[in-house]
């Protein structure tokens, strides 16, 4: 906190500009008006202060705003967002995209932080709803963000948003998130050949029905073990012993590591013996 | 993660010139600040210049304007400050400091610094 101290003759700011960065921070605490900041936030981002100086300010606008900023501060905020808790974003009202968008692009490329989960979880606190307009900005600044959702959140998921998602994106998604997403995916890569297909869908493949999975063993897909642990047992369950081989190709190897693991051991367990045994693996019933 | 690493500092008569250099471990984005500060036995820290590397903006200090120039060259991620005319008054510890939208584990924002190198002025 900085002391309270009266400003030096003749050093009252009349407007935000590249000088400031030369005051010490008493200087700032006591020479910058508050409102005038708030009014001239855009331009605090195009001046090079230093993070003891964004404090200062931040301290100014907080004092000036004690119950949360208005949204036209919020807007332009900039990296002065970096310096905010999840406390203070609480107190914000953001109902704009603008605003959201602004606030994300400052901490592109770096992991979701507190500060933005809470700044996301406000705006879609104040808009009611996950509208596609929304998803469509999370998803792009954050494909992960999906499986953070709840299944019922992610029903209003656009197959359009599906694009921008990368097989990590889903490492977090549980099995009814990919119930949800599976179909999207589907309906979002129709249009792609086989083998760009699979590629694309491949990391959705936990949510994907009996009757896909026969589908692709028809299409010389190769699909690694990896994949094929994670897919719904009781999907999995009714293959055969020939469309897993299909489906596995050369994969279908890696079998007897995983014998004694869902969903390979209760796969094994529903297949006839002598089926088993034309895969030359060893595998029990 | 960012490493600054000052070097030029030494002793110099008043009105001859000393270059300083602060070499950046890595790589100084588009969105970084570079500043040089300076610091006076017994005094407190003060901003000497600044460059915003995107718009490549310079800004300097009254007191060291038309005799101290700070430039930066992105190929060797180096800053650099130029200092001439050089006074009594302009012996400190001089730092270089990186802004940039980098950030902790939580979020919040990290700056860099180097040690300093001193500069002393002296006849």
């Known amino acids: 906190e900085v002391e309270k101290t009266a400003c030096p003759s003749g050093k009252k700011a009349r407007e935000i500009d590249e000088s400031l960065i030369f005051y010490k921070k008493w200087e700032l605490e006591a020479c910058v008006d508050a409102a005038l900041l708030a009014t001239q936030m855009d331009r605090v981002n195009a001046i090079p202060f230093t993070y003891e100086q964004l404090d200062v300010l931040k301290h100014k606008l907080d004092e000036l705003y004690p119950q949360g900023y208005p949204e036209s501060v919020i807007q332009h905020l900039g990296y002065l967002f970096l310096k905010m808790s999840p406390e203070d974003i609480r107190k914000w009202n953001v109902t704009s995209l603008e605003t959201l968008k602004a606030l994300l692009e400052v901490n592109k490329g770096h992991e979701m932080s507190p500060q933005v989960a809470t700044l996301i979880d406000r705006f879609v606190k104040g808009r009611g709803q996950l509208d596609k307009d929304t998803l469509d900005t999370l998803t792009a600044f954050y494909p992960g963000y999906l499986c953070s959702l709840s299944p019922e959140e992610l029903s209003s998921v656009p197959p359009s948003s599906i694009w921008a998602v990368r097989p990590q994106d889903l490492d977090t998604c549980d099995p009814r998130q990919l119930d949800v997403l599976y179909p999207k995916a589907r309906l979002a890569f129709q249009n792609m050949n086989g083998s760009e297909y699979f590629v694309k869908i491949q990391s959705f493949l936990g949510g994907a029905p009996t009757e896909d999975l026969k589908a692709l063993s028809q299409q010389n897909v190769s699909m690694d073990l990896a994949t094929f642990m994670k897919l719904r047992t009781d999907a999995v369950l009714p293959l055969t012993v020939a469309e897993v081989q299909k489906l596995l190709g050369p994969h279908v190897e890696g079998l007897k590591a995983e014998e004694r693991h869902r969903p390979v051991r209760d796969w094994i367990l529903r297949q006839r013996q002598d089926d088993l045994d034309t895969l030359g693996l060893g595998l029990q019933g | 993660q960012v490493q600054l690493v000052e070097s030029g500092g030494g002793v110099v008569q008043p009105g001859r010139s000393l270059r300083l250099s602060c070499a950046a471990s890595?790589?100084?984005?588009?969105?970084?600040?570079m500043h040089w500060f300076r610091q006076a036995p017994g005094k407190e820290r003060e901003l000497v210049a600044a460059i915003s590397v995107g718009t490549t903006t310079y800004y300097y200090a009254d007191s060291v304007k038309g005799r101290f120039t700070i430039s930066l060259d992105n190929s060797k991620n180096t800053l650099y400050l130029q200092m001439n005319s050089l006074r009594a008054e302009d012996t400190a510890v001089y730092y270089c400091a990186a802004y940039g939208v980098d950030v902790d584990v939580n979020g919040y924002l990290l700056d860099y610094w180097g040690q300093g190198t001193l500069v002393t002025v002296s006849s």
């Open positions: 890595g790589t100084i984005s588009d969105t970084s600040r």
